[in-house]
């Protein structure tokens, strides 16, 4: 039961974790306008994400703009975009695995085969999260190195936006929850009790987690 | 609305040295930096550098490294940008221009109306 | 440093021609490319930032597109008050650079 708890709350965070990261690379809070002393730098507050930019003038009034064309982008903006959708997919991937190894699901009648799927599943929610940490990382890391560097002008200067903070939270989120989905399942057939219980059942298994959950992928 | 004003139109004898103002107005000064460009009667323009009007933190195109010397006073909003050993293909108007612009959409957006330099024997 | 190579250096086009200006860098400059219009006895204007983004109050008619090495300025559809001088500038890295300048002319 403890394994198909840890499963649970593996899979509950990772979709958690996706959701925060698909609102993550999708909301334009990446970079904001930075806040010198006690006073705005400028009028208007200006929001950058990886889609669209939005400038918020003094009247409360805001005007997005989507960026003009795919390839004209600084590539570093490019390679932001490219982590963000292939880290939502891979998740995604992750939760199709885990699905078929899911002990409710016939995608898979071997105990073992199923433990392995899990121990997959989780692996690849890893690797999403540590997909989405690097874009946010790496804009993090240029925001602060602009902040104080002396020839970046107070206008230009921005601060870590919300959408660093949820992709952080993705990141983290993704990775416990594939941790815990990695260490339920350290073989195919060291479950214990709860296993043996299965296997001699006639009932269906009392820990049928739902199939409906997310896998979760950060975003970027 | 936002200003630049430049200082009147100098003449030099080679050797010398030039200094041009640009008195910046209509906004928050020590926000943008400015930009100083230079062009020759007919011909293309030319990027000298810029100064950060907040802590005179300044960056300039190697070519005139050594030469070009940009200040700033921020009690009167005002860029200098002092050129020395001037020779006679140093004849050029001289803009000061403010540098905006967030994501990756940058540019000058202002500029100063210019000061013409004459250096001349 | 980087060198920026404006084609032609001049032409001549007719009211309502298509116009198209071409800026070549010696270097990749990851689309931090602005263009500017300079009317005779006047300063440059910004017409473009980002390579595409056109600046706000400038005719919808002006456009550029490009990426790597290779930008463009394109006029839809050329006007009289059009006639002027454009410059391409980099801003990929110092010294930003400009190109030598289109002078564009009404046959």
């Known amino acids: 039961m403890a394994s198909a708890g840890m499963q649970i709350l593996g899979v509950v965070l990772t979709l958690l974790g996706w959701v925060n990261g698909l609102v993550s690379c999708a909301l334009p809070m990446w970079k904001v306008t930075a806040f010198i002393g006690n006073s705005i730098v400028v009028a208007q507050v200006v929001w950058e994400g990886l889609w669209m930019s939005c400038v918020v003038q003094s009247t409360g009034q805001m005007q997005c703009k989507v960026y003009d064309s795919l390839l004209a982008l600084p590539q570093d903006l490019q390679a932001a975009r490219a982590l963000c959708v292939i880290a939502l997919l891979v998740a995604l991937f992750g939760l199709l695995v885990y699905l078929a190894g899911a002990k409710c699901t016939t995608c898979v009648e071997e105990k073992d085969s199923k433990a392995r799927l899990v121990l997959t599943s989780g692996i690849v929610f890893v690797i999403s999260g540590v997909l989405t940490l690097i874009p946010v990382c790496w804009t993090a890391h240029a925001i602060i190195r602009d902040f104080y560097n002396p020839l970046v002008a107070e206008a230009q200067k921005r601060e870590l936006g919300a959408s660093l903070y949820l992709g952080w939270a993705a990141s983290g989120l993704l990775l416990l929850g594939g941790g815990l989905l990695c260490c339920t399942c350290p073989s195919g057939g060291s479950q214990g009790p709860s296993h043996y219980m299965a296997r001699y059942s006639t009932s269906a298994p009392a820990i049928s987690r739902g199939p409906s959950e997310y896998p979760t992928k950060n975003y970027v | 609305q936002v200003q630049l004003v430049q200082s009147g139109a100098e003449v030099k004898k080679p050797g010398a040295s030039v200094k041009v103002s640009c008195k910046a107005s209509?906004?928050?000064?020590?926000?943008?930096?400015m930009h100083w460009v230079r062009q020759a009667p007919g011909q293309s323009l030319e990027w000298i550098g810029y100064v950060n009007p907040n802590n005179g933190a300044t960056s300039y195109n190697q070519k005139f490294k050594g030469r070009a010397t940009m200040t700033v006073d921020k009690s009167t909003s005002t860029v200098y940008m002092e050129l020395s050993s001037l020779r006679s293909e140093d004849t050029a108007v001289y803009n000061c221009?403010?540098?905006?612009?967030?994501?990756?959409?940058?540019?000058?957006?202002?500029w100063g109306q210019g000061t013409l330099v004459t250096v001349s024997s | 440093d980087i060198q920026m190579t404006q084609s032609p250096s001049s032409l001549s086009a007719s009211v309502g021609d298509r116009v198209t200006i071409t800026c070549k860098a010696s270097?990749?400059?990851?689309?931090?490319l602005a263009w500017y219009q300079q009317k005779p006895g006047k300063v440059p204007k910004l017409l473009i930032s980002?390579?595409?983004s056109l600046e706000t109050g400038v005719p919808s008619r002006f456009s550029g597109s490009g990426s790597g090495t290779d930008y463009t300025l394109t006029i839809s559809s050329l006007q009289p008050e059009d006639v002027a001088t454009y410059y391409c500038q980099q801003y990929g890295s110092t010294p930003y650079t400009f190109g030598g300048g289109t002078k564009l002319e009404i046959k």
């Open positions: 270097d990749h400059i990851n689309n931090w």
């Open positions: 209509g906004y928050t000064f020590t926000d943008y930096n």
């Open positions: 221009a403010r540098w905006d612009g967030y994501v990756y959409y940058y540019g000058l957006d202002y």
């Open positions: 980002g390579a595409t």
